[in-house]
């Protein structure tokens, strides 16, 4: 008789999840010499231990602590780029501006980026059929708790001027329910962080509005100011030109506003 399996609303674990995590860890330790002390099998064991045999709606930050410890990494605290709903451009930016880091440029963020995973209570199986959806099933699922944990730690580590890239094409440019709005904003440390600088990325070619005046940006400014952190905002009217100018800052067309 086949064992009854919980059917969740979200997609199941990414296929070849264990192999993918291990391979990403190997690649990361090759690319980042300062992380060559990391044992990738220990990392996978700790990752697995966070969710295997546990109810996928009952995961805690504590479950991820062994993995957090193994993935401890020092990034320059004044070179942190946060993002919300505009991951691809943020990653393109840090690939060019090599001294700046998104969460996905760190080992733990790199390991889990774009992956889904969950287990089942009391079995050592990985559930490849379905995993809990944050809205429809539960918020304390393995993926959500992982990102909440690493995002909190990443924001806590930030200092000086912290940058955030926001998507100006969204109805809510700043969304209080995003990871940035619900976790990172509230874990920036006022005693270390002087300024949060928002870069609002425009979508339309002819969009010349000042999106820094958007009500949601004003809401962000209010939250940040109440936390005794200064706030500044810049419009990035031409993201393609913006990236090009990061690559070639000497280009004569890069002196004008982008």
């Amino acid at each position: 008789v086949p064992r009854w399996r919980q059917q969740w609303s979200g997609p199941g674990t990414t296929k070849r999840f264990p192999e993918t995590v291990l391979a990403r860890c190997v690649k990361y330790t090759e690319i980042h010499p300062e992380m060559r002390h990391v044992d990738c099998q220990s990392v996978w064991d700790a990752f697995k231990g966070a969710f295997i045999s546990k109810h996928p709606c009952n995961i805690t930050e504590e479950d991820y602590q062994p993995l957090m410890k193994l993935g401890t990494q020092t990034v320059p605290c004044n070179k942190i780029l946060l993002w919300s709903r505009i991951k691809d451009l943020a990653h393109q930016f840090t690939q060019v501006q090599r001294d700046m880091f998104t969460l996905e440029d760190t080992l733990l963020g790199y390991l889990a980026d774009d992956l889904t995973w969950c287990g089942e209570f009391n079995t050592s199986k990985i559930n490849y059929q379905s995993c809990p959806d944050w809205r429809k099933d539960c918020s304390n699922n393995p993926v959500s708790v992982f990102w909440k944990t690493v995002s909190r730690r990443f924001a806590e580590a930030a200092c000086d001027v912290v940058h955030v890239m926001l998507n100006g094409s969204r109805s809510k440019i700043f969304d209080k329910n995003s990871t940035f709005g619900s976790v990172e904003v509230h874990n920036l440390q006022p005693e270390k962080v002087q300024t949060l600088e928002a870069w609002v990325i425009h979508g339309g070619r002819e969009d010349s509005r000042d999106l820094c005046q958007d009500p949601t940006i004003k809401e962000l400014e209010s939250i940040i100011s109440k936390r005794n952190i200064q706030f500044s905002c810049k419009n990035i009217y031409r993201p393609d030109k913006f990236l090009q100018c990061v690559k070639n800052p000497e280009d004569s067309s890069c002196t004008s506003e982008i």
Partner: antibody, heavy 120, light 112 residues
């Protein structure tokens, strides 16, 4: 499956240089460092150094510093080890070995070895 | 450099009988990441070395379960529970905790 295929045997004169190749297949070459280890006739194993193909950065054993050069050609998934100013005690079988998945400084799969004979 | 002292040098064994090889590093092999990188390699006659055991006691994929590793501190052991004809060769311990990586002198396992 993971395979490391090395170049053929070489006979060299003292003072000359030798360059041994190691062609990798069955895995993503740039993601795994390549170690070089040698074994003198009837002797044990001696680690020479390691190269990371992604950036080409190297770590050499102190003993070989200044005489060994490890390089890679990413386009052909090949690692090279060149040893200069050869002496008769450099006569050995030279092995390349892939870094172990778990840890940068461990090795899992090895090439078949290349015998280098240094003789006048 | 870490000196790896292996014993015995030669080990004549009867087929089906157990065999045990000792390895003593000159210093602790506990890495700053908490792992102990003590490995065992098998080199059959005319072949290149093959990884048997890594991190003291973990068997590499495809290695028969008659091979086991144990130990801690500066005292490590490789055991073959029942020696088979294909186990003939030289066994090396190695450490990859400290650079340069170093190997033991080898133990030759032969059939009596």
């Amino acid at each position: 499956q993971v395979q490391l295929v090395q170049s053929g045997a070489e006979v060299k004169k003292p003072g000359a240089s030798v360059k041994v190749s190691c062609k990798a297949s069955g895995y993503s070459f740039t993601n795994y460092a390549v170690h070089w280890v040698r074994q003198a006739p009837g002797q044990g194993l001696e680690w020479m150094g390691v190269i990371s193909p992604y950036y080409g950065d190297t770590t050499y054993a102190q003993k070989f510093q200044g005489r060994v050069t490890m390089t890679v050609d990413k386009s052909s998934s090949t690692a090279y080890m060149e040893l200069s100013r050869l002496r008769s005690d450099d006569t050995a079988v030279y092995y390349c070995a892939r870094r172990f998945e778990g840890f940068y400084y461990s090795m899992d799969y090895w090439g078949q070895g290349t015998l280098v004979t240094v003789s006048s | 450099d870490v000196v790896m002292t292996q014993s015995p040098l030669s080990l004549p064994v009867t087929l089906g009988q157990p065999a045990s090889i000792s390895c003593r590093p000159s210093q602790s092999l506990v890495h700053s990441n908490g792992n102990t990188y003590l490995n065992w390699y098998q080199q059959r006659p005319g072949q290149s070395p093959k990884l048997l055991i890594y991190k003291v006691s973990k068997r590499f994929s495809g290695v028969p379960d008659r091979f086991s590793g144990s130990g801690s501190g500066t005292d490590f052991t490789l055991k073959i529970s029942r020696v088979e004809a294909e186990d003939v060769g030289v066994y090396y311990c190695s450490q990859s905790t400290h650079v340069p990586l170093t190997f033991g002198g080898g133990t030759k396992v032969e059939i009596k």
